[in-house]
Interface confidence: medium
């Protein structure tokens, strides 16, 4: 069964900035990625980036940069503008669509006692919505 | 069904704002973006600008910055585009699109448009 | 910015007839383009997205082909209410730009 992993990296330097990992496990190509933060896709989540792999990318603030890792994972650097960090207690889901397989949803936040620079194990903590 | 409802005709004088409404309906404005289209009588279709009404964070083509301010209401789905320092150039149908990111990348559904005159 | 080059400004034909029209874009935008038809005092309704795909309800008649810098929207078997404006827009590229448009004239 495919897989989706999700790390969210609170960055050492910067404490305002935090970088979203996405990965897919399994076979097949993927036709778009799409992550969300505050739910899942169409779920009360809203987009921050979507990645496809011949169109390019699109993100929206507070998404600073988004970009392919390899060809089936991805990262979204983030940029926390306000003096809290709302990012902190916030989920974040990656979506990727995948030809033949159809599309699998992961969320993922940061740990609560999380240090900078450490980051949330790859917790795949599937929701299962195979569309 | 998807449908974009736009405001009523705008009658402005040159120098003055108006501010343009795009009501969706059946879907969540959270989850496309919106883009506006500018078309004057008898010309081709030019391109404003687009809000991703979930994060607040508008693109302007660069002709319209400072002309044009696109801004939403998620709770009442509703889009809008505030046009200032009116001049005759502006007289022209404004038109909101749904820009969709899952299959389509560009804009798929389209409102009726808005006419906007700048007369003194 | 991306220019869109439509370069025929108005054409015309025939019902029944097959149509072709054309859009080249300044440089490679993929399959980044969409076409979309304009009837007289209406708004713009999509057509093709992504190259060659048809948006939901759109007769076969209409067919999209084309990818880099070279697009082309055609119409077989034309009818009458085919009469409209025919844009190509590229979004591979912020911002996004519109070909001048083709005016379809019906014989």
């Known amino acids: 069964t495919p897989e989706v992993w999700v790390q969210v990296q609170m960055e050492a330097t910067e404490l305002s900035s935090f970088t979203v990992h996405c990965g897919f496990l399994g076979p097949g190509s993927i036709s778009l990625v799409t992550v969300s933060w505050g739910g899942p896709d169409g779920a009360g989540g809203t987009k921050l980036a979507v990645l496809h792999p011949e169109l390019g990318t699109r993100q929206w603030a507070p998404a600073r940069q988004a970009r392919w890792e390899t060809q089936s994972s991805i990262s979204l650097a983030l940029e926390d503008s306000g003096a809290s960090s709302p990012f902190a207690n916030t989920t974040f889901c990656c979506k990727f669509a995948s030809f033949p397989e159809g599309s699998w949803e992961s969320c993922g936040s940061l740990p609560p006692s999380s240090d900078p620079g450490l980051s949330a194990p790859p917790t795949p903590v599937p929701i299962l919505r195979a569309d | 069904q998807v449908q974009l409802q736009q405001s009523g005709p705008e009658l402005a004088r040159p120098g003055a704002s108006v501010k343009l409404s795009c009501k969706a309906s059946?879907?969540?404005?959270?989850?496309?973006?919106i883009s506006w289209v500018k078309q004057r009588t008898g010309q081709g279709l030019e391109w404003i600008g687009e809000?991703?009404?979930?994060?607040?964070?508008?693109y302007y083509s660069e002709k319209f910055k400072g002309k044009a301010t696109l801004t939403a209401d998620k709770s009442s789905n509703i889009a809008y585009m505030q046009l200032s320092s009116l001049t005759s150039e502006d007289s022209a149908v404004y038109f909101c699109a749904r820009s969709d990111y899952s299959d389509y990348w560009a804009m798929d559904y389209w409102g009726q448009g808005t006419s906007v005159t700048v007369s003194s | 910015d991306i220019v869109m080059t439509q370069s025929q400004k108005c054409m015309s034909t025939s019902v029944g007839d097959r149509v072709s029209i054309t859009c080249k874009a300044s440089?490679?935008?993929?399959?980044?383009v969409a076409w979309y038809q304009q009837k007289p005092g209406q708004s713009p309704k999509t057509l093709i997205y992504?190259?060659?795909n048809r948006h939901t309800g759109v007769p076969d008649r209409f067919t999209g082909s084309g990818s880099g810098t070279d697009f082309t929207l055609t119409i077989t078997n034309v009818q009458s209410e085919d009469l409209a404006d025919y844009f190509c827009l590229q979004h591979w590229n912020y911002p996004w730009t519109f070909g001048g448009g083709t005016e379809l004239e019906i014989k």
């Open positions: 059946g879907y969540t404005l959270t989850s496309h973006g």
């Open positions: 992504l190259a060659s």
């Open positions: 809000i991703y009404p979930g994060s607040e964070s508008p």
């Open positions: 440089q490679n935008v993929r399959s980044a």
